[in-house]
């Protein structure tokens, strides 16, 4: 079995994780893509996904997760805003290509979120209010809740991550202002 590699990112609560997952342009541009958490014992679980087919540069927000698929660059951008300690864990990008199995994009992201104020540039946090740089218009993709699932296989592209510095920003004093919680029955 291929040894799966990880990139470790240590961030503070309130910061934003910004991940770029590269993929082969021609092959996967319009394929649906997802952000998954790897639970104990190699049990991936989808947290958010793009639309099907995936739209170019169209932000999709699911809770505190924002996905943007840049077809022309062959990369899926994943942001997790207002990070919480509980967000710590192992994550991966996958590409969904029915009827084939999903493809996993390397590297996996080992996210470690710690408590405490960080005054470093790009931390998206100050003492009085949280400032999150978020696309002003986002939609929520309908990730499957109870439809036929598939399992994950591996594919070789790389992923990179850093602390978020997106182009457009909205100043928010309340985290809930930016959380588009899924609509429940």
């Amino acid at each position: 079995a291929t040894k799966l590699t990880e990139e470790k990112y240590e961030l503070k609560e309130g910061q934003t994780l910004d991940v770029k997952c590269d993929y082969t342009l021609e092959k996967f541009a319009s394929s649906q893509k997802a952000w998954q958490i790897i639970r104990d014992g190699e049990m991936p679980k989808t947290l958010a996904c793009t639309e099907r087919p995936s739209k170019n540069s169209h932000p999709v927000q699911v809770g505190r997760i924002i996905l943007e698929d840049y077809h022309d660059h062959g990369l899926l951008r994943v942001r997790m805003v207002n990070l919480q300690v509980e967000d710590s864990g192992l994550y991966q990008c996958v590409i969904y290509q029915p009827p084939k199995e999903p493809h996993m994009l390397f590297d996996r992201i080992r996210l470690v979120v710690t408590k405490g104020f960080s005054g470093t540039p790009g931390s998206n946090e100050n003492s009085t209010q949280n400032v999150y740089k978020i696309p002003p218009t986002t939609t929520k993709a309908l990730c499957p809740l109870y439809t036929s699932p598939r399992t994950v296989t591996q594919a070789p592209p790389k992923s990179t991550a850093d602390v978020s510095t997106p182009d457009s920003e909205i100043n928010l004093t309340n985290v809930t202002d930016i959380i588009r919680v899924p609509v429940f029955n």
Epitope: R39, G41, G63, M80, P102, P144, P149, R150, T151, V152
Partner: antibody
Framework: QVQLVQSGAEVKKPGASVKVSCKAS????????MHWVRQAPGQGLEWMGI????????SYAQKFQGRVTMTRDTSTSTVYMELSSLRSEDTAVYYC???????????????WGQGTMVTVSS | DIVMTQSPLSLPVTPGEPASISCRSS???????????LDWYLQKPGQSPQLLIY???NRASGVPDRFSGSGSGTDFTLKISRVEAEDVGVYYC?????????FGGGTKVEIK
């Protein structure tokens, strides 16, 4: 239709091992994670662990670590749960329960086996 | 481990009347994707448990609409708008936010 059929009741002596099977049908076996949950007489539900039938990877509750082994046979669409060093407190009904696989957001157990009663007595 | 606390322990109900069960978790079950990883199950006498509600408030297939789930974070509620005789049994909440999955102690619903 989709169902999980478990093996029959077992009576074991303390210190022995028991192996319970759970045969899946009506769906793609490797696309759904399988959990094991037990219930002591008159008690609540207790999660034991999970197996990914696709690759065979497992994760066990700390309480059962070292005593439980979950395996699968893809050719027969069957998962197994073996519990060793049995003691009287292990007397319970053991259930296998299906969880949606990696692509689905939900983690709920939508299909349950009928349960297997395991009695540990000297 | 995340501890799940259910109340009441026992709930005597009158058919046609509403019923409510509470479930509290020791840690937030709200994930980064906005979903609460909390499910509700009903175990009827002599049967295996059956799924009622998943992800906090989504009714499982075939579950009557008199059942509803609500709540977020650490406080959740299962409501039955009009109890029917067939609803008797033990109700369990379960968290899937963190390993190990843990269940509440159960609430026994019985007809008065």
């Amino acid at each position: 239709q989709v169902q999980l059929v478990q093996s029959g009741a077992e009576v074991k002596k303390p210190g022995a091992s028991v192996k319970v099977s759970c045969k899946a049908s009506g769906y793609t076996f490797t696309s759904y994670y399988m959990h094991w949950v037990r219930q002591a007489p008159g008690q609540g539900l207790e999660w034991m662990g999970i197996i990914n039938p696709s690759g065979g990877s497992t994760s066990y509750a700390q309480k059962f670590q070292g005593r439980v082994t979950m395996t699968r046979d893809t050719s027969t669409s069957t998962v197994y749960m073996e519990l060793s060093s049995l003691r009287s407190e292990d007397t319970a009904v053991y259930y296998c329960a299906r969880e949606a696989g990696s692509w689905l957001i939900s983690t709920a157990f939508d299909i349950w086996g009928q349960g297997t009663m395991v009695t540990v007595s000297s | 481990d995340i501890v799940m606390t259910q109340s009441p322990l026992s709930l005597p109900v009158t058919p046609g009347e509403p019923a409510s069960i509470s479930c509290r978790s020791s840690q937030s079950l709200l994930h980064s994707n906005g979903y609460n990883y909390l499910d509700w199950y009903l175990q009827k006498p002599g049967q295996s448990p059956q799924l009622l509600i998943y992800l906090g408030s989504n009714r499982a297939s075939g579950v009557p609409d008199r059942f509803s789930g609500s709540g977020s974070g650490t406080d959740f509620t299962l409501k039955i708008s009009r109890v029917e005789a067939e609803d008797v049994g033990v109700y369990y909440c379960m968290q899937a936010r963190g390993t190990p999955w843990t269940f509440g102690g159960g609430t026994k619903v019985e007809i008065k």
